[in-house]
């Protein structure tokens, strides 16, 4: 039975040209995390594999940095980065947990970030 829950940074906004941290945290389960995928629509941005570490898609290697933790840092944001991002935790024996984050990249300097949390 899947008992875990994923907390995310929720809906967040950031300024064009700036950077943002996408963060998810899996709790309430003792399942082993074997891999975390970060996806945007049908594109795989990055993978953090328990054995092989981080691998960033060649399409994003100049603008995506791994971490902190199992999170992902997006840099040099453009308006086209606006949209849904998914953290997909592959675990054993539970299976797959998915978290959703909506990022809005704003032209103005009044971008306000949604509530953040610190991973303990």
């Amino acid at each position: 039975m899947m008992t875990g829950t994923i907390e995310t940074t929720g809906n967040i906004s950031a300024e064009k040209g700036g950077s943002i941290i996408l963060q998810c945290h899996l709790s309430s389960t003792t399942a082993q995390v074997t891999q975390v995928n970060w996806e945007q629509q049908d594109q795989l941005l990055a993978i953090c594999n328990a054995d092989l570490g981080w691998h960033i898609s060649p399409s994003f290697k100049d603008r995506v940095a791994p971490g902190p933790g199992l999170g992902l840092t997006l840099q040099s944001l453009t308006v086209n980065d606006t949209g849904e991002y998914f953290c997909i935790y592959h675990t054993y024996p539970d299976g797959t947990y998915t978290g959703r984050i909506f990022l809005e990249v704003l032209e103005s300097s009044v971008a306000e970030h949604g509530a953040r949390f610190q991973i303990p």
């Epitope: 891999q35 594109q43 795989l44 054995d51 092989l52 570490g53 060649p58």
Partner: antibody, heavy 118, light 110 residues
Amino acid sequence: EVQLVQSGGGLVKPGGSLRLSCEASGFTFSDYSMSWIRQAPGKGLEWVSRINSDGSRTNYADSVKGRFTISRDNAKNTLYLQMNSLRAEDTAMYYCARGPGFFGFDIWGQGTLVTVSS
Amino acid sequence: SYELTQPPSASGTPGQRVTISCSGSRSNIGRNSVNWYQQLPGTAPKLLIYSNNQRPSGVPGRFSGSRSGTSASLAISGLQSEDETDYYCAAWDARLTGPLFGGGTKLSVL
């Protein structure tokens, strides 16, 4: 130019051994995981083995586990595949390739033919 | 056994659009991105599409990829005679802890 140059194939009897080499140039070899992939005559591609960038972690396909050993020498920019207890079914073109395969293998060696026959 | 299933053959006429399918499971295509390779006779495979739909530099825009659930497809539009060769899909497989390749599809340009 980014390239992988392979050597070490040939004809070997069943039960014999062979070592393949793959020399990298044009990129920082020590930054990349590397893999071996093979292709039996007229057949499809089969992943054989992988080693991480510093050589501390390796993985093998079940078909070669316990018989093949992947290794690397980052000082020499070279990847190796030691093949022992060879069988007729190991006959194939062997390719080295850059990466573990999550986002595909972007650089391939030219291939080296291994024939296991008595 | 672990499997990505491709049709053994496909065909089209010059200028036409053809698609090649690749079917997998939750442990591979359902969990990781799909990559496609083109292999000309007597040469090493060449990466054609990575991360489901991304083209490496130098690959013509006629080639495109998509993924849905546990299946993927490669589309080739404006088919040309030089496209007549073998195509392989691949995806990382969690159980194999390595990439899994499809059996390959031989494309004929009629």
